[in-house]
Interface confidence: low
């Protein structure tokens, strides 16, 4: 299953199938989740090692039992990939790392006047992989407001470098952030030239596309199709790259296929996984396991469920049958595509799924209406659980904020329904961060079921918690996924990195914001939030945020929007926006319910509504 | 010039047999995996039978699982139908085409030939 | 097996028109979405292939989009001869299967 935990102090003795420069144990762990056999990770930063030369050193690993060893190691950190993890499967990575120079391939130089500019360049130019900005305090005048995109040939850098005054972080084209646009098409009996970065066997073009899209240096392809003249080159897909970003020429050849990475596309990229099965075929590779199950999508779930599992082959022959059971053979390979594909065969074959980022159909766990108020804009993919609740009457209005936590379910506030509890007038857009793009013509959920905690009682500040069952099933994107629930009545983690976010008033007597606003605001004790509020009970099932001096708070339109917190490296939700004192008010923090306390219930009523276990745990 | 070319069908009475061809031209049959489609009068396009390119694998739909067989000859460049214990609901035009098996679409198809099933 | 729904069954447009024609599958099928045409007393005709792809000699008026369950073909600029029944086709797994068929007529 997902393993989500990460060890400090601990370094895995053993297993290293490959070794890289990442700035933190996060992006450690994300090469680890896309390195075909990587289950486990290691990551050294700079103040664990005096040795310069395995400074911000990651270090994969593989094992045949899952584990390895662990040695202790001050200031090391540890942990598993996240295959098998769903929805937070992803390889967009945003943070900016300030004083560290990420070292690379230098290929081009300019002044812009913020590192958030420079990541921007480097998201809108083809060869960018990171980049390194010198702020106007850089100790060397000339290169003061310097924006250097680089690239280098793992995609990783090949230094990283404490050093003052610089901040580094990586281009947001996994993010499907980049302005480049990208070219979906096929080209039929069409050979690309230029220099191969890498040699794969792929069943079809559109399995060598997504692999290129993933692949550090791979810009366009050219797969050879089973039906090409030269036998040992049959289902080869080449991965290409060229000096320009583009081919330099094409020449017709019948049976190939070529076409582009799909990583400069906008808002949307494929996912990092194959779902389809190819009837007829074989995949062959290093045997990892074989059992005997009946049909060949149990053998592909047994593979998604065999975490070393790549691919599989299901066998109808009829010596590997017995009754309605078939063997099926796990196999995996040293770069995760078969070895050799055989045509015209007794068997079906396909790939695993652990790297679909879609996951089951699950919400994720780990073991007086009020918005934002002092604020800034978000970006696109920030918050990607974030949805707006809106009603349909005369007119069309957002009203409250609510946060996805799986396909098919929203957690908010109860207090949003107070007086308009039937569901047809309601309409929930997710994925969006403009509420002006929202035209007649924005897809949007309708609601199936809305279930008001049974203790809630309107105008009373208790138990102001909801779920929403959506009719449909939305699929996961960048800019649409769900928020990691907490583990039941999580008292003992201390968070300091929390935000709040709505589209909710500006101001006290303001109105609803076209961008999605955030907010870091930092928790507050219960016994202090009870001082500030000595009319209203503060029960533990509420959790307090706020600055003492005011100025930056949830108001009216933020009621049911998420407080998250990040901890590990991972999102939670701690809070769902409820009520307060005004907006900002100094002394007067908002009031919050704490979804940790309201596990037990969040779990009854996702499983009992369609009788199947809906929670997942990534701990 | 890719062709195929059916031929076989006719009028048979139900219960009765039929042996369909096809012959392929204009491309080297042997590397491509060969599908049979049929269109009953007025009606929509329903998948029959596929067959690999070298003849090893053979796929059925469950309505003529038992009484058809799929079959090929690469060194005559030719496609086969034999349809055995025909019905009235076999009634239609049959057509080959050529599965793109890297891209699962069928680019190239016969004219058709239609097969009654009548008493 | 996998059920493809299209809609609408016919379809009325005058030449120069847009038409529009959807398929719905009914489990995830990826990319793996075919459109064909085909006249009366004629064999069908590839138009698109992979949800989008054009196939070679097929006019640029004709695109298709979607992915997953959701499909759609987009005839824009309707000429004399696009007139003709519109077939949907999931390629993702045996048994292949087909739509129901969309007749464009002209109005």
């Known amino acids: 299953g997902c393993l989500t935990q990460l060890y400090e102090n601990a370094f895995f003795r053993g297993g290293d199938v490959a070794s890289m420069y990442t700035p933190n144990a996060q992006y450690c762990q994300m090469r680890c989740t896309f390195h075909p056999r990587c289950l486990l990770f290691s990551f050294l930063p700079a103040s664990s090692i005096n040795d310069m030369e395995k400074r911000f050193g990651c270090f994969l690993k593989d094992s045949v039992t899952g584990t390895l060893p662990k040695v202790h190691r001050t200031g090391a950190v540890s942990g598993h990939s996240l295959k098998q993890c769903g929805h937070q499967i992803s390889a967009c990575h945003r943070d900016i790392y300030k004083g560290v120079d990420m070292r690379g391939v230098n290929f081009n130089v300019s002044k812009v006047s913020s590192v958030e500019e420079c990541q921007k360049r480097c998201t809108s130019n083809i060869r960018c992989q990171f980049f390194s900005y010198a702020t106007q305090t850089f100790h060397k005048a000339e290169y003061r407001n310097n924006c250097l995109l680089k690239y280098s040939p793992g995609g990783t850098p090949t230094a990283i470098k404490v050093l003052s005054n610089v901040e580094s972080g990586f281009s947001l084209k996994p993010c499907a952030l980049s302005e480049i646009g990208c070219h979906m098409n096929i080209f039929q009996h069409l050979a690309f030239s230029d220099v191969d970065v890498a040699r794969v066997l792929t069943p079809d073009a559109f399995v060598c596309r997504t692999i290129c899209t993933y692949h550090p240096n791979c810009l366009f392809f050219t797969f050879y199709t089973n039906v090409w003249k030269i036998e040992s080159q049959r289902n080869v897909c080449l991965l290409k790259t060229s000096e320009s970003g583009t081919p330099s020429s094409s020449t017709p050849q019948e049976n190939t296929i070529s076409g582009y990475s799909l990583l400069t596309c906008k808002r949307t990229l494929p996912e990092p996984c194959h779902s389809k099965i190819y009837p007829g075929v074989d995949f062959g590779g290093e045997e990892l396991n074989v059992t005997f199950v009946k049909g060949v999508n149990v053998c592909q779930e047994t593979c998604t469920k065999m975490i070393r599992c790549q691919f599989f082959t299901y066998s109808l022959l009829p010596e590997d049958c017995k009754e309605e059971k078939c063997k099926c053979f796990l196999r995996l390979s040293m770069d995760g595509s078969p070895t050799r594909i055989a045509y015209g065969t007794q068997g079906s074959s396909g790939y695993s799924l652990r790297l679909c980022n879609t996951g089951d159909n699950s919400v994720c766990t780990t073991k007086t209406s009020t918005r934002i108020v002092g604020g800034t804009n978000s970006s696109w993919g920030e918050w990607p659980w974030q949805v707006s609740l809106q009603v349909k009457l005369t007119a069309q209005r957002h009203l409250c904020g609510g946060s996805l936590i799986g396909h098919q379910w929203v957690l908010t506030a109860a207090h949003c329904f107070d007086g308009l509890p039937l569901q047809d007038v309601w309409r929930i857009y997710s994925g969006i961060l403009n509420l002006s793009d929202i035209t007649k013509d924005t897809p949007f959920s309708q609601i199936k079921e809305i279930i008001i905690h049974q203790n809630y009682k309107v105008s009373e500040g208790n138990h102001d918690i909801a779920l929403i069952k959506l009719q449909a099933p939305l699929n996961y994107t960048e800019f649409q996924k769900p928020i990691c629930l907490p583990s039941k009545g999580d008292t003992s983690t201390i968070y300091t990195n929390c935000w709040v976010t709505g589209w909710g008033f500006s101001k006290e007597k303001g109105e609803i914001q076209n961008i999605l606003q955030k907010v870091n605001i930092p928790l507050v004790t219960n016994e202090e939030c009870q001082k500030r509020y000595q009319d209203y009970k503060i029960t533990q099932r509420m959790v307090c945020a706020g600055y003492k001096e005011g100025g930056k708070d949830a108001c009216k339109g933020d009621s049911g929007g998420p407080l998250v917190c990040k901890h590990n490296g991972m999102w939670r939700l701690v809070g769902i926006t409820s009520w307060g004192e005004g907006c900002a008010r100094r002394e007067q923090p908002g009031v919050y319910t704490k979804v940790a306390e309201y596990m037990d219930w969040i779990l009854e009523k996702t499983q009992s509504s369609d009788g199947k276990a809906q929670m997942q745990s990534p701990a | 010039e890719v062709q195929l070319l059916e031929s076989g069908g006719g009028l048979v009475q139900p219960g009765g047999s039929l042996r369909l061809s096809c012959a392929a031209s204009g491309f080297t049959f042997s590397f491509y995996k060969m599908i049979w489609v049929r269109q009953a009068p007025g009606k929509g396009l329903e998948w029959v039978s596929s067959i690999s390119s070298s003849g090893g694998s053979t796929q059925y739909a469950d309505s003529v699982k038992g009484r058809f067989t799929i079959s090929r000859d690469n060194s005559k460049n030719t496609l086969y139908l034999q349809m055995n214990s025909l019905r009235a609901e076999d009634t239609a035009v049959y057509y080959c085409?050529?599965?793109?098996?890297?891209?699962?679409?069928?680019?190239?198809w016969g004219q058709g030939t239609l097969v009654t099933v009548s008493s | 097996d996998i059920q493809m729904t299209q809609s609408p069954s016919s379809l009325s447009s005058s030449v120069g028109d847009s038409a529009t024609i959807t398929c719905r599958a009914s489990q995830s099928i990826s990319i793996y979405l075919n459109w064909y045409q085909q006249k009366p007393g004629k064999a069908p005709k590839i138009l698109i292939y992979?949800?989008?792809q054009l196939e070679s000699g097929v006019p640029s008026r004709f695109s298709g989009s979607g992915s997953g369950t959701d499909f759609t073909l987009t005839v824009s600029g309707l000429q004399p001869e696009d007139f003709a029944t519109y077939w949907c086709q999931q390629s993702y797994n045996v048994p292949y299967t087909f739509g129901q068929g969309t007749k464009l007529e002209i109005k």
């Open positions: 085409a050529r599965d793109r098996v890297d891209l699962g679409y069928l680019d190239y």
């Open positions: 992979g949800a989008s």
